[in-house]
């Protein structure tokens, strides 16, 4: 973990640029800056979001340009822009700095923003190094700034990946963890008494030799006992493999303002109380105007620094500032063995063959729970299913209304009429039957063995 720091020194017209002020706007205005950090120097980095982090500066002092007056030294926002990073510092990164002007005149809908300049810089930078200065031009503007990356203890090193302890500290965290990731000499140690064991002794003052627990003697060469580690504390020895527990990432609680600390692999995470945020819950006095709710969270209350705000988080985010992404796939929402994909803005289920639906809840090969609309019936067969639709309906689920007359079902010039329960054929003279398929003999008897009672030739015939 660590912090990237950016200091803006000046912003104004570049050499040879138009002698105009960034404040040339109608009415009062003020400047502010935003920084975006992306890992890597490659072209792909241009397509990635601000994965290392981003920060918005405070607004600068309000300035009203005086007509005919020369542009003064530009009032810039105070302080550093700080972008905390939780993981390793990548060493190579892309830096984007936006310079914005907020116009405080009487615009409809509140103050408007103007993007004055946007500079992009790709650099290699080791954490812990000195400030790097830079001058960048964007159009007629010139931006002068310095930046650095620094680790936050216990992290040290050019990538903030080594965990540091002072020479005088004990070796391991709680529970006798292996000490491989810990650096032994993060501070220049004092010169100890000649011959003092490098492994079992240490000194805080020059010329002394103090022993780690479990060792004794003037030079800390003598083990106190030969018993192996029985408790949590034991001799620090390469022969027993036991190490004295030392500080873990949460020891001493690095979280300020009542935040609670939880260890993560190689680092820690603070859960902040309402009203505080930041890597160590160090940012306070926040109101909704500061926009403390991340990832599209809606801020409610907190009109002044003494009153708390509440972030209403959008689906998929949680935490007092909506800063934590919920692992929605852990709830196993996809049924029937579907693969869960959390796309951030939505959950997707990739269904196994034979299943469908937003949560793979429909078994395509099963009539159970399968609804065929409009009186259709589900028929299984061949490892799949289909709907056998009632007359007048079609489609996979019998939801489409079919035109029963489309197939010209009435024979011998009979006229077809669609009817709510099917179709009706009005037969031409000399024919009868549901589809007008039977000729009427001259003696008035049809070719049917027996006509339904009450039907005369030429009557419309209903087809059930």
């Amino acid at each position: 973990a660590g912090v990237f720091e950016l200091q803006i020194h000046s912003f104004g017209p570049g050499p040879g640029g138009a002698p105009r002020s960034p404040y040339s706007a109608r009415g009062p205005c003020r400047l502010f800056f935003r920084v975006c950090l992306k890992p890597g120097l490659s072209e792909e980095a241009a397509e990635s979001p601000c994965a290392l982090g981003a920060a918005l500066s405070a607004r600068g002092p309000v300035y009203t340009e005086q007509p005919e007056a020369p542009a003064p030294d530009l009032p810039l926002p105070n302080g550093l822009l700080q972008v905390p990073f939780r993981d390793a510092w990548p060493g190579t990164f892309s830096l984007i700095i936006e310079t914005w002007r907020e116009e405080l005149g009487d615009q409809i809908g509140g103050p408007a923003w103007s993007l004055l300049a946007r500079v992009t810089r790709r650099r290699r930078l080791a954490a812990g190094g000195p400030w790097a200065g830079d001058i960048q031009r964007a159009g007629a503007w010139e931006l002068r700034f310095s930046y650095r990356a620094r680790c936050e203890l216990p992290a040290v090193g050019t990538a903030c990946t080594r965990l540091c302890r002072p020479r005088s500290a004990s070796r391991c965290g709680p529970g006798l963890r292996p000490c491989a990731p810990l650096e032994d000499e993060c501070e220049a140690p004092p010169v100890c008494r000649a011959g003092c064991s490098l492994e079992h002794g240490f000194c805080e003052q020059p010329g002394e030799c103090r022993c780690l627990e479990g060792w004794t003697g003037p030079l800390c060469m003598v083990p106190v006992s030969t018993s192996s580690c029985l408790g949590l504390r034991g001799p620090s020895s390469t022969t027993t493999g036991c190490l004295v527990p030392g500080p873990g990432p949460c020891d001493g609680n690095p979280c300020a303002n009542g935040g609670s600390c939880s260890e993560t692999p190689g680092s820690f995470e603070c859960t902040c109380p309402r009203g505080f945020y930041g890597l160590r819950c160090e940012v306070s006095g926040v109101t909704c105007a500061d926009g403390p709710c991340f990832n599209g969270g809606l801020c409610v209350g907190g009109a002044d620094p003494d009153s708390a705000y509440i972030c209403h988080c959008p689906p998929g985010f949680q935490g007092s500032n909506c800063e934590k992404r919920v692992d929605r796939c852990s709830l196993q929402p996809c049924r029937n063995g579907g693969l869960c994909l959390d796309l951030g803005h939505a959950l997707r289920c990739r269904c196994r063959a034979g299943f469908a639906g937003p949560r793979c809840e429909h078994d395509l090969n099963d009539c159970a729970g399968r609804a065929c609309a409009n009186g259709g019936t589900c028929v299984e067969g061949g490892g799949a299913h289909r709907c056998s639709c009632a007359l007048g309906f079609g489609g996979r689920d019998c939801r489409e209304r079919a035109d029963p007359c489309a197939a010209r079902p009435c024979a011998h010039g009979g006229r077809c009429y669609a009817h709510f329960s099917g179709l009706v054929c009005a037969c031409a003279p000399g024919y009868m039957g549901a589809r007008c398929e039977f000729p009427v003999h001259p003696d008035g008897v049809s070719a049917l063995p027996a006509a339904p009672p009450g039907l005369r030739p030429g009557d419309p015939q209903r087809y059930p």
Epitope: C36, P49, G109, A112, G344
Partner: nanobody, 127 residues
Framework: QVQLVESGGGLVQAGGSLRLSCAAS????????MVWFRQAPGQEREFVGG????????AYADSVKGRFTFSRDNAKNTGYLQMSSLRPDDTAVYYC????????????????????WGHGTQVTVSS
């Protein structure tokens, strides 16, 4: 998922006006930044301006301030770019983009910060 469709582009004389629309479908976008970028042949995609996710305020590239205005109709899920006093160097394909981030401050001027994009509409300004 959000789908964005731009319309309203075309050929116009220098000094003329055009109004571009960006219609969003798929889900409500009232809490999204809805912004416009443009890309001239052989150039990088350039931020033009739009409305923030946080409070709907307008943000402008300095080069278009005073000539272009941005608005949105949340009921219609549509954003608008009204362009006037057009110049030949405004000729480009204009793209609409949307995202819920950043949660405060002006919208990002960096294309990679936007998840949703339209396919673009051509604006040609003749002299």
């Amino acid at each position: 998922q959000v789908q964005l469709v731009e319309s309203g582009g075309g050929l116009v004389q220098a000094g003329g006006s055009l109004r571009l629309s960006c219609a969003a479908s798929g889900r409500t976008t009232s809490r999204y930044s809805m912004v416009w970028f443009r890309q001239a042949p052989g150039q990088e995609r350039e931020f033009v301006g739009g409305n923030s996710a946080h409070d709907g305020r307008s943000a402008y590239a300095d080069s278009v301030k005073g000539r272009f205005t941005f608005s949105r109709d949340n009921a219609k899920n549509t954003g608008y770019l009204q362009m006037s006093s057009l110049r030949p160097d405004d000729t480009a394909v204009y793209y609409c983009a949307a995202d819920t981030n950043p949660p405060y401050g002006p919208p990002w001027s960096t294309p990679s910060e936007y998840e949703y994009w339209g396919h673009g509409t051509q604006v040609t300004v003749s002299s």
